[in-house]
Amino acid sequence: LIIGFGISGRHSITVTTVASAGNIGEDGILSCTFEPDIKLSDIVIQWLKEGVLGLVHEFKEGKDELSEQDEMFRGRTAVFADQVIVGNASLRLKNVQLTDAGTYKCYIITSKGKGNANLEYKTGAFSMPEVNVDYNASSETLRCEAPRWFPQPTVVWASQVDQGANFSEVSNTSFELNSENVTMKVVSVLYNVTINNTYSCMIENDIAKATGDIKVTESEIKRRSHLQLLNSKAS
């Protein structure tokens, strides 16, 4: 969490951002909130990016002002206009690119004063893994598959029954480059699976951690997956 305060002539206002991560090719949110004003026309929001000359986005007098917007953000940004009045200056970034990573500044001017806060934005690719019994195998084998990751993640298997066991000798992980030549498909296979056990396939890079669990019993299997973004720190 980054909390910034204004310092010049007028009073300072509190601006808060949260470090976040964008999934390349999808839409992302750069989060920023501020002390609200009672008049929309008195609020100015400017988003800037370190190393970029033009603005990322500007919103003032109740509407977007994009005359000074940098080319790399053209047609890809929007604020939540109906939420600005309640102090939401978050920016929606469409079609996140690898090059969108960096330090952003959310700069706010209201009738109460000015304030700003920085935000670290990471970009990469992350996706939910699906674990299944691999029916191409002769013995009971699990296959964990996740369609899009970047940078290359680590894959670790764990089991509820054999807690602390190292499965690296009985698993095999491969990374296959996707057609856009950036992200990769992750496939990991675990051999010698036993019944009445829950196995977890954990995929992690510096942006996200995803886990696919599968419970294997005589009657059936049950699977579930979850994904968590790392380093979501507020400023």
């Epitope: 029916y135 002769s138 009657s219 299997i221 699977r223």
Partner: antibody
């Protein structure tokens, strides 16, 4: 007594959506996954997907992913199947069932007819 | 997906006959379930975990098999056994059923 009671028959036009309900009673709703299975007239059984009522986690048959949506309302112990972009081949009896233990329980079935 | 093939698709038998239905899976699935369905009714779990009889199922029914090949046997067919039987696997997603075997009166 465990019971799964489904909503009544529906007639829909191609392209429309249908929402079938399955009200559970006689057991703790959040303790057992609910499965949805369909059976076209004179045909076999086809698994659509499953939902865990405790947290609404779902697994779908890839064939129905994007068209089928499974939800639950734990306050009324009711599971729902919504199927969108209906086509004539979706004409079937749709069943909800509770996950297998040593017994299983099924709803009575809901006939969905898709016809222009 | 794992495909399940039942044979025969239908059979005619007399009361007292021994009846065997087989189910073959395209991959090893370890355990199989069987359902009985009568016209206009929901299916009922009949045999689970390959060989365990569901609650209320008579002992003339039995199940066996492993890997890819499974069998449901009725040792002495009774009038109430005339129905359609489906094999079913829940050991690999998506869960799948056999196409069914209809047991009819000769």
């Amino acid at each position: 007594e465990v019971q799964l009671v489904q909503s009544g028959a529906e007639v829909k036009k191609p392209g429309a959506s249908v929402k079938v309900s399955c009200k559970a009673s006689g057991y703790t709703f959040t303790n057992f996954w609910i499965h949805w299975v369909r059976q076209a007239p004179g045909q076999g059984l086809e698994w659509i997907g499953e939902i865990d009522p405790s947290d609404s986690y779902t697994n779908y048959n890839q064939k129905f992913k994007g068209r089928a949506t499974l939800t639950v309302d734990t306050s009324t112990s009711t599971a729902y199947l919504e199927l969108s972009s209906l086509r004539s081949e979706d004409t079937a009896v749709y069943y909800c069932s509770r996950e297998i233990t040593t017994v299983d329980y099924w709803g009575q079935g809901t006939l969905v007819t898709v016809s222009s | 997906d794992i495909q399940m093939t039942q044979s025969p698709s239908s059979l005619s038998a007399s009361v007292g006959d021994r009846v065997t239905i087989t189910c073959s899976a395209t991959s090893s699935i370890s355990y199989m379930h069987w359902y009985q369905q009568k016209p206009g009714k929901a299916p009922k779990l009949w045999i689970y975990d390959t060989s365990k009889l569901a609650h209320g199922v008579p002992s003339r029914f039995s199940g066996s098999g492993s890997g890819t090949d499974f069998t449901l046997t009725i040792s002495s067919l009774q009038p109430e056994d005339f129905a359609t039987y489906y094999c079913h696997q829940r050991r690999s997603y998506p869960f799948t059923f056999g196409q069914g075997t209809k047991v009819e009166i000769k």
